[in-house]
Interface confidence: low
């Protein structure tokens, strides 16, 4: 990977006035032992509300690639495969918590910081507003 | 709130031989200000694939409170506002990171932890196995 | 720390083979199910091949049975995909995954190697 040059002003591990830090062990643990990766892997396609999936790259982020959905229709699939405008095709989107290294560059430094992301499409109801 | 004892075995935050760990800022930023949380808070109830939230809380994990997704019906919704079984309810499934206090109850201490949650769910074109 | 880093992509002619090989490092790799995934250019993420732990059972999405075949080596870390009768249509971003649920939020992937197949 890439070797990121650090950072002359980043904080020592040791300072106590760091604001509001804590000491973080990133040897991840993963409680997702029974799940069968198949299984969802291919709901992006066979979904009446289909997306593609686009890489979101950022190395100073933790975890540094994100996967973001993206609706490919603005309608919805219907029973004949053709797209139905009557429905509408929306992103599911969750707030994350991700590290980011603060200041840039610092190997051992980071902050949370909370984005949104789109994790895939469902299929809705439009709100139709009736002029009077 | 609820006052957690400290555990006795915390290991110290100026502990430079604590595994693979790094300082960690919780000052949350948010990215997400130009958002409306109220546009999609209502997709729940009006996707073909609808589903209820569950509140999912550990007072030993940061974010100690997580909304976890549950499809209402096996089957989707159809224009009639009936259940069509032909179609299958499925959810969306998405890792996420999440910090777990490592010793138990330490307050400057913790680890990444990555757990599967259900963000919402989608309709999908069931796969038919064929007998031969 | 997790790598995976691909390599043997190419051009080539349609009709022609390329094998790919995915070197990986940092996890137990022989615990894990791996994946190859490809992303055509502007299309969507496709899952390609599955292999199980020991390597006894492999599932291929239906556009490449037949055509692909994908192996490891678990004393070696390593992954591979041997391409055949390769198609304008499987042009795209090859990436190795480590056993999780797609789409894949933690960054277990390489760089990806690129896949051109054209006359």
């Known amino acids: 990977g890439i070797t990121i040059p650090r950072n002359p002003g980043c904080p020592n591990s040791e300072d106590k006035n760091f604001p509001r830090t804590v000491m973080v062990n990133l040897n991840i643990h993963n409680r997702n032992t029974n799940t069968n990766p198949k299984r969802s892997s291919d709901y992006y396609n066979r979904s009446t509300s289909p997306w593609n999936l686009h890489r979101n790259e950022d190395p100073e982020r933790y975890p540094s690639v994100i996967w973001e959905a993206k609706c490919r229709h603005l309608g919805c699939i219907n029973a004949d495969g053709n797209v139905d405008y009557h429905m509408n095709s929306v992103p599911i989107q969750q707030e994350i918590l991700v590290l980011r290294r603060e200041p840039p560059h610092c190997p051992n430094s980071f902050r949370l910081e909370k984005i949104l992301v789109s994790v895939g499409c469902t299929c809705v109801t439009p709100i139709v507003h009736h002029v009077a | 709130g609820i006052t957690i004892p400290r555990n006795p075995g915390c290991p110290n935050s100026e502990d430079k031989n604590f595994p693979r760990t790094v300082m960690v800022n919780l000052n949350i930023h948010n990215r997400n200000t130009n958002t409306n949380p109220k546009r999609s808070s209502d997709y729940y109830n009006r996707s073909t694939s609808p589903w209820n939230l569950h509140r999912n809380e550990d007072p030993e994990r940061y974010p100690s409170v997580i909304w976890e997704a549950k499809c209402r019906h096996l089957g989707c919704i159809n224009a009639d506002g009936n259940v069509d079984y032909h179609m299958n309810s499925v959810p969306i499934q998405q890792e996420i990171l999440v910090l777990r206090r490592e010793p138990p109850h330490c307050p400057n201490s913790f680890r990444l932890e990555k757990i599967l949650v259900s963000v919402g769910c989608t309709c999908v074109t069931p796969i038919v196995h064929h007998v031969a | 720390e997790v790598q995976l880093v691909e390599s043997g992509g190419g051009l080539v002619l349609p009709g022609g083979s390329l094998r790919l090989s995915c070197a990986a490092s940092g996890f137990t790799f022989s615990s894990y199910s791996m994946y190859w995934v490809r992303q055509a250019p502007g299309k969507g993420l496709e899952w390609v091949a599955e292999?199980?732990?020991?390597?006894?059972?492999?599932y291929y999405v239906d556009s490449v049975k037949g055509r692909f075949t994908i192996s490891r080596d678990n004393a070696k870390n390593s992954l591979y995909l041997q391409m055949n009768s390769l198609r304008a249509e499987d042009t795209a971003v090859y990436y190795c995954?480590?056993?999780?649920?797609?789409?894949?939020?933690?960054?277990?992937w390489g760089q990806g190697t690129l896949v051109t197949v054209s006359s």
């Open positions: 292999i199980k732990q020991d390597g006894s059972e492999q």
């Open positions: 995954a480590k056993g999780e649920i797609l789409p894949l939020y933690f960054d277990y």
